[in-house]
Amino acid sequence: MAQGTLIRVTPEQPTHAVCVLGTLTQLDICSSAPEDCTSFSINASPGVVVDIAHGPPAKKKSTGSSTWPLDPGVEVTLTMKVASGSTGDQKVQISYYGPKTPPVKALLYLTGVEISLCADITRTGKVKPTRAVKDQRTWTWGPCGQGAILLVNCDRDNLESSAMDCEDDEVLDSEDLQDMSLMTLSTKTPKDFFTNHTLVLHVARSEMDKVRVFQATRGKLSSKCSVVLGPKWPSHYLMVPGGKHNMDFYVEALAFPDTDFPGLITLTISLLDTSNLELPEAVVFQDSVVFRVAPWIMTPNTQPPQEVYACSIFENEDFLKSVTTLAMKAKCKLTICPEEENMDDQWMQDEMEIGYIQAPHKTLPVVFDSPRNRGLKEFPIKRVMGPDFGYVTRGPQTGGISGLDSFGNLEVSPPVTVRGKEYPLGRILFGDSCYPSNDSRQMHQALQDFLSAQQVQAPVKLYSDWLSVGHVDEFLSFVPAPDRKGFRLLLASPRSCYKLFQEQQNEGHGEALLFEGIKKKKQQKIKNILSNKTLREHNSFVERCIDWNRELLKRELGLAESDIIDIPQLFKLKEFSKAEAFFPNMVNMLVLGKHLGIPKPFGPVINGRCCLEEKVCSLLEPLGLQCTFINDFFTYHIRHGEVHCGTNVRRKPFSFKWWNMVP
């Protein structure tokens, strides 16, 4: 039960006090008791419940005509059952007794009021009155947890605007309101109560820049909402009429959880006594609601695809046709960024990561815009963000970044359980160097901090700085599977490729050519690849790098070897011993449900079929997956990327609610 104030009574004159329903009010009957008195009794109006405890141990007894010893160990508390119809209509009489004096009476006139700040603390999508039932001042995780949820209002419901909705202090329309969380103030008081009392809504100064609260005029259009709290206003005096009244507030978060903001925002209503104009206002009662800002959540390849993004660039029509066909098979919407908008930047995966935010009443896709800021810089802001599609970015917007800050270097695993610890939304994966050095690359700390602060997809740092581009999507992917954990981890594997080529040579296919049919590309015989000592040394190094990640992933995702599929792939080391795919990197694939868009490797054709394609199909088709090999050689591969790098996918949010997990 909420804490009320302390009321001191005195026999000299009647005491007038306010008691808020649902609070426990302490009665100090000792400090002003007549000197010779040694005991007391209490009588109260039917609407008042008095508890007297004489401890320790505390023996509680409801009032009757009994007398109690007048000593500091006696605790008297009041609660009120109903709100008062008029000021002071509930009475408590304390009678003091002494051996030689007649009884001395002290009178307390109580006004019972109902003041309750309600939000969706039960996470049902509805605001229900919760007075005296739950403590709204704490926020707890898990299926039995409680606490309200706020969305960062980071979409743009107004298409004429270039800013996010949370960047202005206006409510555009009902669409804008739906992105906010409802909070209701319920009051029931005597008609004249607010002539001597005031209600103030407030937020801590440390949180005022993270939240905005709009007050709605009930029954009127949303355009009647006016801002009452926010970055410029930590508190607001409310004009509340007496009697029974409900006041609606709409609350939007302005910031995502981050290293300097744990994501919790407390809104408090304070009842102030303003009856004495000569004195400052006195706090009579406070009620608070704590909200947690919904985290930004990534979606893994195992979530159903809803929309595919790609770029139109010079001469990639065939690539786009293949992606279009794949999207149609997977029943996905397709969005193509035209040449004039992408400015010859085709790397859609690197520019953005599409996740979502969720409250019980609303789910919103949100694009996380990377700070790489090349030709596609404007695409997430201008073309992706919009009505019911949010936007967030982090990191320096001018310089100070590396290739590891592109979001080909940001992936998320499917849900996993690791040594008994559940990650129902999976774990974020990003690449790093294995140790810091003068020229090693790492994901910008601001990005790392943001990802960690979301709490619900605890990040795992992998080693990717050995790659020229340096992205985790160059050596791993996840595909859905009907058995085991519901997915397989795919890892690029030089060892598997050498094994395959050796088998082909043993069967007399040593003359078969890699890169056959590619104009202006020097073809390589299987036997020459197998006999090239330098290439073998390079791939031995690459294998060690991938194996390091393999063990890391097994440990951090709780995987067994049988959860991993090795995809045959060779690499070559280029300048500064950085690795690049020797032929199109098949693990860098587009996963649309059971439909896979895999870079066409142009492997040796044996018996009319590419042996690399055949091998990959034999590994993936038993899982119910359909492999489509896409020619990305000149448009993507030779520019240091593949199909996954050149595409992006919006996926269906998890059915699991993030607040039901325990981070």
Epitope: D439, S468, L573, E575, F576, R639
Partner: antibody
Framework: QVQLVESGGGLVKPGGSLRLSCAAS????????VSWIRQAPGKGLEWVSF????????YYADSVRGRFTISRDNAKNSVYLQMNSLRAEDTAVYYC?????????????????????WGRGTLVTVSS | QSALTQPRSVSGSPGQSVTISCTGT?????????VSWYQQHPGKAPKLIIY???ERPSGVPDRFSGSKSGNTASLTISGLQAEDEADYYC???????????FGGGTKLTVL
């Protein structure tokens, strides 16, 4: 073959900044590794910085690390060297140089360590 | 003080051969096959004449040849000609924190 032209040099006070540009013509610079090399008056060559063709990693000499930043804009066919906190010992002719990354051998590393195309250089003078 | 050591100057008569040495350490010249040589005429930009120890870019006469033994690389110019008079610089990839090193340069005089 690509041709390179440096610009942006000039006189600057110690502690000041300059941004050098290296513009390419005759070919697409995105196919090339690019390095900056400098030569102080009457002295030898000193390697300064490198950026790979994919624009995904960079390297610096100890003498400039933390003060200089190399970057590239393949759409503009240019590479840049942002020089901050300049010192008197940074006075030199700055050359932009490149090596083609479009190599077809099974393994052909090393092209980022040599420079087969050079610009004519731009003079940077740091003096109060 | 340059990281790779070259003689300050060498000279030779037309038609003769000269060799310029470039001494490094086991962390650069001795470790990698990424040694290159540049020719620089006064007031001009350097020009690549040898890369990967002994390979010649197209257009460079076969009078120029490169080799390496241990931590020392060498440039040999046979059949010296007047236009060979220039400064010559060696360069190597290095595992040190500065990944490309140059020698201090050698002035070749054709007598």
């Amino acid at each position: 073959q690509v041709q390179l032209v440096e610009s942006g040099g000039g006189l600057v006070k110690p502690g000041g900044s300059l941004r050098l540009s290296c513009a390419a013509s005759g070919s697409t610079l995105s196919d090339y590794f690019v390095s900056w090399i400098r030569q102080a008056p009457g002295k030898g060559l000193e390697w300064v910085s490198f950026i790979n063709s994919a624009n995904t990693f960079t390297y610096y000499a100890d003498s400039v690390r933390g003060r200089f930043t190399i970057s590239r804009d393949n759409a503009k066919n240019s590479v840049y060297l942002q020089m901050n906190s300049l010192r008197a010992e940074d006075t030199a002719v700055y050359y932009c140089s490149s090596a083609n990354d479009d190599v077809d051998d099974i393994v052909a590393p090393g092209r980022g360590y040599y420079m087969d195309v050079w610009g004519r250089g731009t003079l940077v003078t740091v003096s109060s | 003080q340059s990281a790779l050591t070259q003689p300050r100057s060498v000279s030779g008569s037309p038609g003769q051969s000269v060799t310029i040495s470039c001494t490094g350490t086991s962390g650069d010249v001795g470790r990698y096959s990424h040694v290159s040589w540049y020719q620089q005429h006064p007031g001009k930009a350097p020009k690549l004449i040898i890369y990967n120890v002994y390979e010649r870019p197209s257009g460079v006469p076969d009078r120029f040849s490169g080799s390496k033994s241990g931590n020392t690389a060498s440039l040999t110019i046979s059949g010296l000609q007047a236009e060979d008079e220039a400064d010559y610089y060696c360069s190597s990839h290095s595992r040190s924190s500065t990944p490309v090193l140059f020698g201090g340069g050698t002035k070749l005089t054709v007598l």
